[in-house]
């Protein structure tokens, strides 16, 4: 018999339920007690190297001491039994680990899947964390035969793939047992025919064919998975344009039985579409396959569906009897071009006179016209045909434009610059919106867009910058020519000015001073200047602030002290904050003009 260990703890490897009570007993060997001259009274219990209070001990007899824990909350407790030997030295007798956790809960939501070509896999919800090694066993049987147990692996404890091959059209019963050191529970049993749990392989070899006759259709063909010989399939077919992120779906009722091709209709011409397809058992019992690999195709071209936006500009410096007119138009977006644009056709007809034709590859045409009224038309052409014509009246030189839009407003919203107006009473064919950045350093380079005559609110479709002042002009266009333009200034987003105003004195008296300043250049304003503040002070005095309306460029400071040095600076404010200008100093005279000491 060995003196080491000097005793033992019972139970040796305890597993206890969390928040339960637990008692351990340390029994000393008689020879050890004899060697160390101790008995159970000398036992010291420790958990994780901390001494347990004596109140938790019970001396059972000369050789045995017990310790009781109530409401165990730790998952892992190192418990040691020690003896106080000669001179209060502690000698370890024995140690155990108390493992605590919870019994397994009844597994729930048991479900099985048969992936085509693979064996059946079942999964379940194992319930709460037990903090213990818990083994899950999937059990299955026919009415006449028990299958081998499927033991879930440690790294995937809530699923298991059976070892036997799937037989369709015979019902199977399946359940799960969960077991750990604290108990064993069984799930509800489920009974099913594996044919209702099939997840087919996705259709493959998906291909897309276009049609020369119809620019709005594409034909899909595919190869069905082998499971089609066991079950009838239904399909989901989804498609999107190449650049889109969301999918559209063919109505499911159109693809509700086994097939290997489908024609998709109502598509846009000359557009690349991406398709994918999946399938499942036609009665909806089972699982959808994964999506097939994507396949793409391009619909055939169609003639352009819309005439381009069309406008003109007249060079103000015109020679006697003639004027230079620049006709401008916008490239059609792909969904309206419906194919590769080949060229543009422009016709110009002088009022009740002969017609001139132009074929142009660019998006502008400069022509010399007489001072008469002209009718211009524009069509765009692709491989299939021509668009409808955009018609524009270029009025005679003496034409007086009237009927502007009313209540023109411009405002930023959702990172866009919106423009709205009240429509004139007269029938408007279209509106032309023009805008440019106002700058002291560069000319106003205009961008433009066209809106239908029914529109009275839109946003500027350009690359707009923050803290820039945009001059926006709205021109209504009538059958006989353009109406009067209306303009407004706006900012996409204001900021504080980049510089403050530079203040100076215009006139200084004994008790007052007239200050003046220049309006800030538009390039440094960064927004609408709403007001100015003048700050002035003496070397020893407090600062005084005076608010001044933004329309002013001078202001008189009164009640000043004579023969005194003043420091003054000025700030300009937009809706987003202010910026100070440089400080300026002046001294009031000791006497007023003509005054003697």
């Amino acid at each position: 018999e060995l003196l080491d260990p000097c005793g033992y703890i019972s139970p040796e490897s305890p597993v206890v339920q969390l928040h339960s009570n637990f008692t351990a007993v340390c029994v000393l060997k008689e020879k050890c007690m004899d060697y160390f001259h101790v008995n159970a009274n000398y036992i010291v219990w420790k958990t994780n190297h901390f001494t347990i209070p004596k109140e938790q001990y019970t001396i059972i007899n000369r050789t045995a001491s017990s310790v009781t824990f109530t409401d165990i909350a730790s998952l892992n407790i190192q418990l040691t039994c020690n003896i106080l030997t000669f001179g209060q030295l502690e000698q370890n007798v024995y140690g155990i680990t108390i493992i605590s956790g919870l019994p397994p809960e009844k597994p729930k939501n048991l479900s099985c899947i048969v992936n085509e070509g693979k064996k059946m896999r079942c999964e379940w919800d194992g319930g709460r964390e037990t903090h213990l090694e818990t083994n899950f066993t999937l059990k299955s049987e026919w009415a006449t035969h028990k299958f081998a147990d499927c033991k879930a692996k440690r790294d995937t404890p809530t699923s298991c793939t059976v070892d036997y091959s799937t037989v369709y059209f015979v019902n199977i019963e399946v359940w799960v047992e969960a077991e750990n050191a604290l108990g064993k529970v069984t799930s509800d049993h489920i009974n099913f025919d594996p044919v209702y749990k099939v997840k087919p392989n996705p259709p493959h070899n998906l291909s897309v064919i276009n049609s020369e006759e119809l620019s709005s259709i594409l034909k899909l063909t595919w190869t069905n998975p082998s499971i089609k010989s066991v079950i009838i399939l239904k399909y989901n077919i989804q498609y999107r344009t190449k650049d889109a992120s969301t999918w559209s779906q063919i109505p499911p009722e159109d693809t509700a039985s086994t097939r290997s091709s489908f024609t998709v209709q109502d598509l846009k011409p000359f557009t690349e579409y991406v398709f994918r397809i999946r399938c499942m058992k036609e009665d909806g019992k089972g699982y959808w396959s994964d999506w097939s690999e994507e396949a793409s195709g391009i619909t055939y071209e169609d003639r352009p569906s819309k005439a381009p936006s069309f406008w003109y500009k007249i060079d103000p410096s015109h020679t006697q009897g003639y004027r230079t007119v620049q006709l401008v138009w916008k490239t059609l977006p792909p969904f309206e071009a419906n194919g590769k644009i080949l060229d543009y056709e422009v016709t110009l007809t002088r009022w009740k006179s002969h017609l001139q034709n132009y074929t142009v590859n660019a998006t502008k045409l400069t022509v010399n016209l007489t001072n008469d009224r002209y009718l211009a038309t524009l069509t765009v052409r692709n491989l299939v045909g021509k668009s409808d014509a955009a018609v524009l009246t270029i009025p005679a030189c003496d034409f007086q434009a009237t009927h502007p839009v009313m209540d023109l407003k411009a405002f930023p919203k959702d990172n866009m610059l919106w423009v709205e107006w009240t429509t004139p009473r007269e029938s408007v064919k279209k509106y032309i919106l023009e805008w440019c950045v106002l700058s002291d350093k560069a000319p106003c380079i205009t961008d433009w867009q066209q809106e239908d005559g029914t529109v009275h609110r839109t946003y500027l479709r350009g690359n707009l910058a923050e803290s820039k002042c945009y001059l926006i002009t709205v021109t209504p266009v009538y059958a006989d020519g353009p109406g009067s333009p209306e303009s407004i200034k706006a900012y996409l987003k204001q900021a504080p000015p980049s510089k403050g105003p530079t203040v100076r004195t215009k006139k200084v008296g004994k008790n007052e001073a007239v200050l003046e300043w220049d309006q800030l250049p538009v390039d440094v304003q960064n927004g609408f200047i709403r007001n100015y503040t003048i700050f002035y002070r003496t070397i020893i005095g407090n600062e005084t602030a005076v608010n001044v309306d933004s329309s002013h460029t001078e202001y008189t400071l009164s009640s000043l002290t004579s023969d005194t040095l003043y420091m003054v600076r000025m700030a300009a404010y937009t809706d987003e904050g202010g910026k100070d200008g440089p400080e300026f100093t002046f001294t009031t005279p000791k006497f007023a003009q003509g005054e003697i000491e």
Partner: antibody, heavy 115, light 108 residues
Framework: QVQLVQSGAEVKKPGASVKVSCKAS????????ISWVRQAPGQGLEWMGW????????DYAQKFQGRVTMTTDTSTSTAYMELRSLRSDDTAVYYC????????WGQGTLVTVSS | DIQMTQSPSSLSASVGDRVTITCRAS??????LNWYQQKPGKAPKLLIY???SLQSGVPSRFSGSGSGTDFTLTISSLQPEDFATYYC??????????FGQGTRLEIK
């Protein structure tokens, strides 16, 4: 203070038995065991066995198994060691010692085995 | 059985010397080793128990060390009354308890 007092010297004939006593005082007799050790003339120490004064459990060295008996009388705080079938090589000083630590020893009892 | 081997079996030293006696166990005995001193005609006396604990009443010049299989008894400064025979003994495995063969310490 702790004392272990042994019985006096004995002379025995081969084949006879000897019973040596060891009276303990100065501590609680039942709290610790008694070990027996002998030492032949000019030789080293040889452990014979141990008895628990509390439970009466005992351990004997293999060499003495069947020939030795160790007992205690708690009423008198005395331990006894009886060795039977004595041989001449059993001639030695027999010591009792307290516990398995041998922290206190008796004065020794000389047992001479001679024909 | 566990064999205990002491070395040297005898040694000569002078008063004031530092003396070391070693004891080797044939297998690990943890720290369950005691050292005894025996003078002629007297019962042995416990010096050190549990490898390094000094028995009460024993002078502090005696010290013990070691664990497992190798142990040492050291007398830091030899006194005239220290000339005797010294035994090591293991209590780890019982039965049997075993002693070393002894080391005789003589005056040089």
């Amino acid at each position: 203070q702790v004392q272990l007092v042994q019985s006096g010297a004995e002379v025995k004939k081969p084949g006879a038995s000897v019973k040596v006593s060891c009276k303990a005082s100065g501590y609680t007799f039942t709290s610790l065991g008694i070990s027996w050790v002998r030492q032949a003339p000019g030789q080293g120490l040889e452990w014979m066995g141990w008895i628990s004064a509390y439970s009466g459990n005992r351990d004997y060295a293999q060499k003495f198994q069947g020939r030795v008996t160790m007992t205690t009388d708690t009423s008198t705080s005395t331990a006894y060691m009886e060795l039977r079938s004595l041989r001449s090589d059993d001639t030695a000083v027999y010591y009792c010692a307290r516990s398995l630590r041998f922290d206190y020893w008796g004065q020794g009892t000389l047992v001479t085995v001679s024909s | 059985d566990i064999q205990m081997t002491q070395s040297p079996s005898s040694l000569s030293a002078s008063v004031g010397d530092r003396v070391t006696i070693t004891c080797r166990a044939s297998q690990s005995i943890s720290s369950y080793l005691n050292w005894y001193q025996q003078k002629p005609g007297k019962a042995p006396k416990l010096l050190i128990y549990a490898a390094s604990s000094l028995q009460s009443g024993v002078p502090s010049r005696f010290s013990g060390s070691g664990s497992g299989t190798d142990f040492t008894l050291t007398i830091s400064s030899l006194q005239p009354e220290d000339f005797a025979t010294y035994y090591c003994q293991q209590s780890y495995s019982t039965p049997p308890i075993t002693f070393g063969q002894g080391t005789r310490l003589e005056i040089k």
